[in-house]
Interface confidence: low
């Protein structure tokens, strides 16, 4: 027989025994070109002196063999005498040490037995009813396949699974989706309905994130407000990196978790845009306003849980940066202006009602006036800050009011609304003898003292009713008592107290009469 042909004679050895643990196994045969074929197998056991024979039986019952010597691979053409269009049965007989060992048989149609490729190119991954769906284009001329997958997590080894039979131009597989860990998948294919055919190699890794992106464990700190009215938000602790299976380490598209920072400016609600989302790497500058900051984690399946922090407002107040003048037509505020064409947001809120919504007004873009001041006015009818109570006023500025991260704080201060002059008048003025020529004057704190920085001082006025002489005594805003000395016994005096602000003189309290009794000696 010629070596290139299958020899239709009895092989040169005795019958085969298939019961041995050693011997030939894992025979696979397939077409490698339009007219070329290849069979290969494994041999278990010592190889010295072993001769291999590839046996083939046609459907007619005629059998032949190829002698391959010590080789465990054979290539032959469609002219070798083996019917490639009809079903044939193939096996290997290995002869060694006067005994023959036989492999399991493979029955197939050689022409249709193509060496299958694994899924190639782009494998699309999506979520379907709590499972993972993978989809890919069927390799050219390979429609009709059995597909397997294997998968592992960072803490588990490979596990094998079946995708079931595929018979279309696109193939797909439903696989388990892990809730909290990343997975690596690989796929392989073989010809459908051809148990004897060999599996393709495994595909490149497909890296799949957990269904739930990890909760971002980060910490923020916020710097003090700078002279420009802005403070920097800094990340104290980076989010922990997702643990990845071995094949997904390095640049592994598909498992990336992206973290985004969502800023919500709580102050100044009347501005155009209250929320902004930006990458976590871009830590923004903030105004002194109150913010909610959320870190949102997301992966290819969408957003996951977020973590939210509250950044309180910077309550540091500037002394007398704000001027308020009250006229018959209404009230005007003045403050040092920022650059040309700046939009200001003026926000006020009664002190002690921080939970309620602040009143907010947005100015049209304005330029500084000749004195370098910016202004905001309102009429008495509007009722703005009309009640006699303490208001917290904050003014923010931005040249780009729609850009949330470009707002800055101009000032933060307090103002007493309504008729502060009258409302601030001290009450419950009382006079007590202190010594033979002095008295102690006490009063209840002015309502203005509830407003930080508003009350500049108290003034106590004492009038001698005999001579009509008047003396005035300034008192620190934190004090509500003063001692009047050098008084004369038997003379009638009146005492009054008023509370002054930086821009407003208060109204005197009701006059309180007193005199020091003349001491009669025994």
């Amino acid at each position: 027989c010629r070596t290139s042909e299958c020899c239709f004679q009895d092989p040169p050895y005795s019958d085969a025994d298939s019961g041995s643990a050693s011997g030939p196994r894992d025979l696979s045969c397939y077409r490698i070109s339009s007219a070329g074929y290849e069979c290969s197998w494994q041999y278990e056991g010592p190889t010295a002196g072993v001769s291999h024979f590839l046996r083939c039986c046609l459907s007619s019952g005629r059998c032949c063999y190829f002698a391959t010597g010590s080789a465990t691979r054979l290539q032959f053409s469609d002219q070798a005498g083996v019917s490639v269009l009809h079903t044939v049965t193939l096996w290997v007989e290995s002869w060694a040490r006067n005994r023959t060992e036989k492999s399991p048989e493979v029955t197939l149609q050689l022409y249709k037995s193509v060496k299958y490729k694994p899924p190639l190119g782009d494998i699309k991954v999506s979520k379907l009813a709590g499972q993972l769906r993978m989809e890919w284009e069927t390799p050219d001329n390979q429609v009709g396949a059995e597909v397997q997958f294997r998968h592992r997590t960072p803490s588990s080894s490979w596990k094998l699974g079946d995708c079931g039979p595929q018979d279309d131009d696109t193939e797909s597989c439903l696989c388990p989706l892990e809730m909290n860990v990343a997975q690596e998948f690989q796929l392989r294919r073989r010809r459908l309905g051809s148990q004897g055919s060999s599996w393709s190699k495994w595909s490149s890794p497909v890296c799949v994130p957990p269904e739930n992106p990890p909760q971002p464990q980060v910490r923020f700190s916020v710097e003090q407000l700078g002279r420009d009215g802005r403070r920097r938000l800094t990340l104290k602790e980076q989010p922990t990196q997702l643990e990845l299976p071995e094949g997904c380490q390095g640049p592994a598209p598909g498992v990336e978790v992206t973290y985004q920072l969502q800023l919500h400016m709580l102050s100044c609600p009347c501005k155009a845009k209250a929320t902004r989302t930006l990458p976590l790497e871009k830590m923004p500058y903030l105004s002194g306003a109150a913010y909610n900051v959320a870190v949102i984690s997301s992966n290819r399946f969408g957003p996951g849980p977020n973590q939210t922090w509250h950044i309180p407002a910077d309550t540091h107040t500037e002394p007398v940066a704000l001027n308020i003048s009250v006229g018959t037509n209404g009230t005007t505020m003045y403050w040092p202006a920022r650059a040309q064409s700046t939009t200001y947001c003026i926000e006020w809120q009664p002190v002690g009602q921080e939970g309620s919504l602040a009143t907010c007004n947005l100015t049209a873009p304005q330029d500084p006036d000749p004195a370098g001041m910016a202004t905001y006015s309102w009429s008495r009818e509007s009722g703005a800050m009309g009640q006699e109570k303490c208001y917290h006023i904050t003014i923010f500025a931005s040249a780009h009011p729609k850009k949330l991260t470009l707002w800055s704080t101009v000032l933060s201060t307090y103002h007493f609304g309504g008729n502060a002059s009258a409302a601030g008048t001290p009450h419950h003025v009382s006079v007590k003898n202190h010594s033979l020529d002095s008295v102690s004057v006490d009063w209840a704190p002015s309502l203005l003292s509830t407003c930080p920085g508003v009350l500049k001082e108290y003034v106590v006025r004492c009038r001698d009713e005999d001579s009509n002489q008047v003396s005035e005594h300034p008192v620190q805003p934190t004090e509500t008592q003063v001692t009047l000395s050098d008084l004369r016994a038997g003379v009638a005096y009146t005492v009054q107290v008023r509370a002054d602000t930086a821009w407003l003189r208060g109204a005197w309290s009701q006059p309180q009469r007193f005199s020091i009794k003349v001491q009669v000696s025994d």
């Epitope: 494994q42 294997r150 803490s155 588990s156 080894s157 490979w158 596990k159 094998l160 599996w199 190699k201 495994w202 071995e246 094949g247 380490q249």
Partner: antibody, heavy 118, light 107 residues
Framework: QVQLVHSGPEVKKPGASVKVSCKAS????????MHWVRQAPGQGLEWMGW????????NYAQKFQGRVTMTRDTSISTAYMELSRLRSDDTAVYHC???????????WGQGTLVTVSS | DIQMTQSPSSLSASVGDRVTITCRAS??????LAWFQQKPGKAPTSLIY???NLQGGVPSKFSGSGSGTDFTLTISSLQPEDFATYYC?????????FGPGTKVDIK
């Protein structure tokens, strides 16, 4: 056929390092993970870790972290396991084992006896 | 780590006997369990993978069953060449762990 052939026996002093090799043949070396398993005299089997011969990626058992290094040379289809800071209780036969397509160890090397003695 | 226990630790049997060895995992490992045979001075050889699948070339007298935490290896008719130590191993979680072994010797 698949064969995993080890380097010869080694005698080492405590504190030294040993490097054992495992030469693979009969299959495509880079297609299958290689694991290392040791067996102390008269004792059971203990898994040490694996190497992916294709990428060089490794996964070590916690017990050996910091002392074991697994490498490979694909040009000669050989995997290596180096164990440092040897102690007397590291005396064992060290086997390489191939992880098959079904994830289990389908072929084992005959092992290398490493004796640690002062 | 997942603990694997085997029982019995040793057994004596005669040729032709049916032998059963059990293996228990400290937590569920699905069917990621293998059985190995080891003879003195030799490397282990694979008998069963995925709890019940026979490794290529292994005679059908060996069979495996079980899932979750409890597994069994059965030798239907013990032959002289089967006297050896048998180990179970889980390969679902790292680190992979082996049972302590069951030694089968001649009665």
């Amino acid at each position: 056929q698949v064969q995993l052939v080890h380097s010869g026996p080694e005698v080492k002093k405590p504190g030294a390092s040993v490097k054992v090799s495992c030469k693979a043949s009969g299959y495509t070396f880079t297609d299958y993970y290689m694991h290392w398993v040791r067996q102390a005299p008269g004792q059971g089997l203990e898994w040490m870790g694996w190497i992916n011969p294709d990428s060089g990626g490794t996964n070590y058992a916690q017990k050996f972290q910091g002392r074991v290094t697994m490498t490979r040379d694909t040009s000669i289809s050989t995997a290596y396991m180096e164990l440092s800071r040897l102690r007397s209780d590291d005396t064992a036969v060290y086997h390489c084992a191939r992880e098959g397509a079904t994830s289990n160890f389908d072929y084992w090397g005959q092992g290398t006896l490493v004796t640690v003695s002062s | 780590d997942i603990q694997m226990t085997q029982s019995p630790s040793s057994l004596s049997a005669s040729v032709g006997d049916r032998v059963t060895i059990t293996c228990r995992a400290s937590q569920g490992i699905s069917n990621y369990l293998a059985w190995f045979q080891q003879k003195p001075g030799k490397a282990p050889t694979s008998l069963i993978y995925a709890a019940s699948n026979l490794q290529g070339g292994v005679p059908s007298k060996f069979s495996g069953s079980g899932s979750g935490t409890d597994f069994t290896l059965t030798i239907s008719s013990l032959q002289p060449e089967d006297f050896a130590t048998y180990y179970c191993q889980q390969y679902r979680y790292y680190p992979f762990t082996f049972g302590p072994g069951t030694k089968v010797d001649i009665k």
